[in-house]
Structures are given as structure tokens and as C-alpha cells.
């Protein structure tokens, strides 16, 4: 089979600070040295890019400075963290992995992680 399998958890609950982390694992059919990981968000039938990073195997993932994502890699596993999430950001977050170099190119897309975000209740005023 020439398809690359990508696994990610079905559900993740964001912390009260709006941070969600999940692992994206891929079964590489080749020996890639350059890998691109993209997080997509699917809402209704629309798919948008949340963040993307290209990394060399053995090195750290580097997202753009203004990205809401951070991550680390270990072998064929990527630990992704998305921050700054609010209740309205609840949705399906899909891990997309591309083996960029050396050839051949492979694409793998996970089934998505449903991230639930609950905005914290505002602290009640106190008279202390």
C-alpha cells in the first residue's frame, strides 16, 4: 500500500488557559529528511490552515513567530500545541504530514482531533 497513515487522538479538551496539545504520528513509507506538518481546521465544509512548519528530521519544529502553534518532534511523532484558543475555536483540527525530501513525495492526512474549548467563567467580584 502506497498511502501514508497519520494517527491523532479523536478528542482533546483545551486547558482553562486556552491551550490544547495533541500528538500526530505518521507511518513513513520512506526515509524522509525534510517533513512539513500542517494543522488544518475544518468547520462545516470549509478547511483553513491554522499553522505549518517544515523541519529536518532530528531538528526542532520551527513555526513562524506569530504562529499560535508550537511543537516538538521525535522520530515519526510530532507533539503539537495550539494556544490562544477560545470557545469559538472549538472544532476539528486535522494533522497533515508531507514527506518533502528526498523523493518520493508522500502526503498523509489524519482523521482530525476534535478540540473543545470552554471559556473560563469570569471571577465574581469580591468585597474582601
Amino acid at each position: 500500500c502506497k498511502a501514508m497513515h497519520v494517527a491523532q487522538p479523536a478528542v482533546v479538551l483545551a486547558s482553562s488557559r486556552g491551550i490544547a496539545s495533541f500528538v500526530c504520528e505518521y507511518a513513513s513509507p520512506g526515509k524522509a529528511t525534510e517533513v512539513r506538518v500542517t494543522v488544518l481546521r475544518q468547520a462545516d465544509s470549509q478547511v483553513t490552515e491554522v499553522c505549518a512548519a517544515t523541519y529536518m528530521m532530528g531538528n526542532e519544529l520551527t513555526f513562524l513567530d506569530d504562529s499560535i502553534c508550537t511543537g516538538t518532534s521525535s522520530g515519526n511523532q510530532v507533539n503539537l500545541t495550539i494556544q490562544g484558543l477560545r470557545a469559538m475555536d472549538t472544532g476539528l483540527y486535522i494533522c497533515k504530514v508531507e514527506l518533502m525530501y528526498p523523493p518520493p513525495y508522500y502526503l498523509g492526512i489524519g482523521n482530525g482531533t476534535q478540540i473543545y474549548v470552554i471559556d473560563p467563567e469570569p471571577c465574581p467580584d469580591s468585597d474582601f
Partner: antibody
Amino acid sequence: QVQLVESGGGVVQPGRSLRLSCAASGFTLSSYGMHWVRQAPGKGLEWVAVIWYDGSNKYYADSVKGRFTFSRDNSKNTLYLQMNSLRAEDTAVYYCARGGLTGAFDIWGQGTTVTVSS
Amino acid sequence: DIQMTQSPSSLSASVGDRVTITCRASQGISNYLAWYQQKPGKVPKLLIYAASTLQSGVPSRFSGSGSGTDFTLTISSLQPEDVATYYCQKYNSAPWTFGQGTKVEIK
């Protein structure tokens, strides 16, 4: 709106060169893999080449490898296909297409016609 | 390289008929399959990706199914505007191979 516009096609003699351009608008070119697909008269679709994101990685169909060069200028939001040593069998409509976020080609240009004939 | 084979190469059906086109990959490609519609003299248009997901704006009479090596595009009720050539394509690895196309005509 999101669109791709090809230009640069024409009639050229075998062995000569031609450069096609594809101007993208309505989206950020550097976020997508971009492809060229061609269609010979009365025939089906044939994938020609892809260029990735920052332009560092490219792949070509065996039929054009060593003769065609795909490049991109993200600052101008434009793609280029340099075609050298053209042959009669390169005669086709050339389409620029965007590899969508999920992999399929979701946006296509209107195409530009290349005729290689003596 | 993985080959994509479509059948039939052409078909003629009546308005309202259910039309089925099949596409077979020479090796398993999971669900990394797209279907395109190309009307005469026009640009190809994405209909379905991920084997069964309808592209935004595509009429619901179009549907896709399959996984691995065998895939199907179905038009539940053929309309005059569906006259076109339909192509399958695999996109999980290079090269991005298309099927040879299926020409759909109205009887």
C-alpha cells in the same frame, strides 16, 4: 477572488524554448503546492510538475524531466514554467492548478495553448 | 508508479438516470482520490476529494465512494448540464496520476 491566470503560450518550432507564467491572486502562494497540468488536443489530463511552498522542492513528470523548469516568485505571486527543447508531443493546453489544503487540485487557471510545430 | 484506470471510457444515458463511473488504482491509495469534471471546451473542476467529500458548491446528486484500490463516482439523477468528461486522480504521492477519463453523454 481566488484565481489563476496563465500566459505565454504560442506557436514554437521543435527544439526551441518558451516560458509560461501563472499569476495568482486572492490567496497566499507560499501556503500551497502549485502544479502544471497539460492536455494534448483530444486527450486526457497529464500532470507535468509541482513546486512546493518556498520553491525549494520540485517534482517533474518523466516526460518533461531535464527539459522543463518550474519556478516561483512569491513576492510577485507568480509561477513560471520554462520549457526547453520542445517537442511536437508537448503540444497541449497548459493549466496552472493549486494543490488545495487537503491535496486535491481545487483551483485551475483558464489554460494557455502551446503548439510545437515546424 | 501507480496507474489509475477508469471504466467505462464513455457512456450514454438518459436524463434522470443513475450513472456510475469506476476508477481503479494499481496499488492501494487509501482515500486520497479526487474526481474532476471537464465540460467541453472548459477548465477541469474539482467535484470530490478524499474519495467521498463533496467540494463546496457541487450539487448533491454527485457522490463518491471507495477506499484502497476501488472507487466510484455516482450521479444519482443525470442532468443535461452533466455532459462532460470525468477524471479520477490520486494525490497521496508523486506523480499525481489521472485516469484516462470517462465521457458522459445524453441519449
